[in-house]
């Protein structure tokens, strides 16, 4: 197992998630990609808790250049040892990947009550509401209501879809970091096991 | 000014269609809502829907499910009103009404109203 | 679906009297619009959410009310107030209409 590459691994795919996080959060101040909503103030209150752009994006690129320099191989070493620096940067990571859980975990909670309350709609009165937020999200299983909402068009499938892409980046995202906790523990107590000659790639 | 026009009076047959129109003039036709009301000769104002002249999306009472269609044309500011399957019962003066979206959604500004007479 | 019941069916008054128009509903609701309503015309809106006066409408008209009863109030009546009054509540599908009240001159 070499925990250098494999902290390089995560922290490149955390870079991609993190992207599409922040991608699938700013989707979600344009339903139907129009801007109308955005200026009225008429999205859903659990857009602007920036879950995909703070949370699991902007958050997450700490601890993925963090486990991406892990794999670099100028470390100086300490108290004679080589891999003593290596060591310590990687229990370090351990404290970036507790910071990316953090941010993960923020995604996932914002987003799945997001999913649970449902968007704010021009409903069938004629009011902005939430009017699925009563449904404790079995509105989710019953597509048929979805036309309750008829301003903005397809915002239920937008909102489900969006907040839905969140939850799993999320959740993948949080998993990931916590294989790094894993990872970046192993690594600091048994030491580096790459040698100069290994090259692995993911 | 602001007003809302309708079509003129239509003598239909049992078991015909009726299209009643509705031209929106003197403010952004997609910013309100349009609804429409039947009247009855001698009888009480009737509920039959609104459709969301933005998106197009109609929702209709219970009662006219199935038989009516509401619709719009953004680019003539002009909402219509469909019903099928006339019975005698549906004479009467259908009105187009604009109505703003919020908290108390009145109904201010009323078309003159559409006389349609169904009768064999 | 909420059913709105106006009394009296019929109020006759004359001239400068003061006419009181009841609409009651058989359950809560938030708010109630009134509409007056002439022979072969269109209605007109009076008051909405209550307790507001529509645009052009005159300060003799008031309305007040909550939970399930509500009034129109007109203070000194005019020979043109003389009309059919309806009210109207959308504090849920289906929106309904109250079956009127006929203000005529005695």
């Known amino acids: 197992m070499c925990y250098g590459k494999c902290a390089r691994c995560i922290g490149h795919s955390l870079v991609g998630l993190a992207l599409l996080c922040i991608a699938a959060n700013i989707l979600l101040y344009f339903p139907n990609g129009e801007t109308k909503y955005a200026s009225e103030n008429h999205l859903s209150r659990f857009v602007w808790f920036f879950s995909g752009i703070v949370g699991g994006g902007l958050l997450m690129l700490l601890p993925a250049f963090v486990f991406i320099g892990l794999e670099q191989d100028d470390c100086c070493g300490c108290c004679g040892h080589e891999n003593c620096g290596k060591r310590c940067a990687m229990l370090s990571s351990v404290l970036a990947a507790l910071i990316g859980i953090a941010g993960s975990g923020y995604c996932v909670i914002v987003a799945a009550l997001g999913l649970a309350e449902g968007p704010l709609c021009l409903d069938s009165l004629g009011q902005w509401n939430y009017t699925f937020a009563s449904t404790e999200g079995q509105y989710l299983l019953d597509t048929s209501t979805w036309s309750e909402c008829t301003e903005p068009k397809h915002i239920v499938e937008w909102n489900v879809s969006l907040f839905s892409i969140l939850l799993a980046l999320g959740g993948i995202e949080f998993i990931l970091c916590l294989i790094q906790v894993i990872n970046g523990v192993l690594g600091g107590i048994c030491g580096f096991c790459c040698s100069h000659q290994q090259q692995y790639d993911c | 000014q602001v007003q809302l026009v309708q079509s003129g009076a239509e003598v239909k047959k049992p078991g015909a269609s009726v299209k009643v129109s509705c031209k929106a003039s003197?403010?952004?036709?997609?910013?309100?809502?349009v609804k429409w009301v039947r009247q009855a000769p001698g009888q009480d104002l009737e509920w039959m829907g609104w459709?969301?002249?933005?998106?197009?999306?109609?929702i209709y009472a219970a009662d006219f499910k199935g038989r009516v269609t509401m619709t719009t044309d953004t680019s003539t500011s002009t909402a219509f009103m469909e019903l099928r399957s006339l019975r005698s019962d549906d004479t009467a003066v259908y009105y187009c009404?604009?109505?703003?979206?919020?908290?108390?959604?009145?109904?201010?500004?009323w078309g003159q109203g559409t006389l349609v007479t169904v009768s064999s | 679906e909420i059913i709105l019941t106006q009394s009296p069916a019929t109020l006759s008054l004359s001239p400068g009297e003061r006419a009181t128009l009841s609409c009651r509903a058989n359950?809560?609701?938030?708010?109630i619009n009134w509409y007056q309503q002439k022979p072969g015309q269109a209605p007109r809106l009076l008051i909405y959410?209550?307790?507001n006066l529509a645009s052009g409408i005159p300060a003799r008209f008031g309305g007040s009310g909550s939970g399930r009863d509500f009034t129109l109030t007109i203070s000194s009546l005019e020979p043109e107030d003389f009309a059919v009054y309806y009210c109207q509540q959308w504090s849920s599908n289906p929106l309904t209409f109250g079956g009127g009240t006929k203000v005529e001159i005695k």
């Open positions: 003197g403010y952004t036709f997609t910013n309100y809502g």
């Open positions: 959410g209550t307790a």
């Open positions: 009404v604009r109505f703003q979206y919020g908290d108390y959604r009145y109904f201010d500004v």
């Open positions: 359950s809560g609701i938030s708010f």
């Open positions: 459709i969301n002249t933005y998106t197009g999306n109609p």
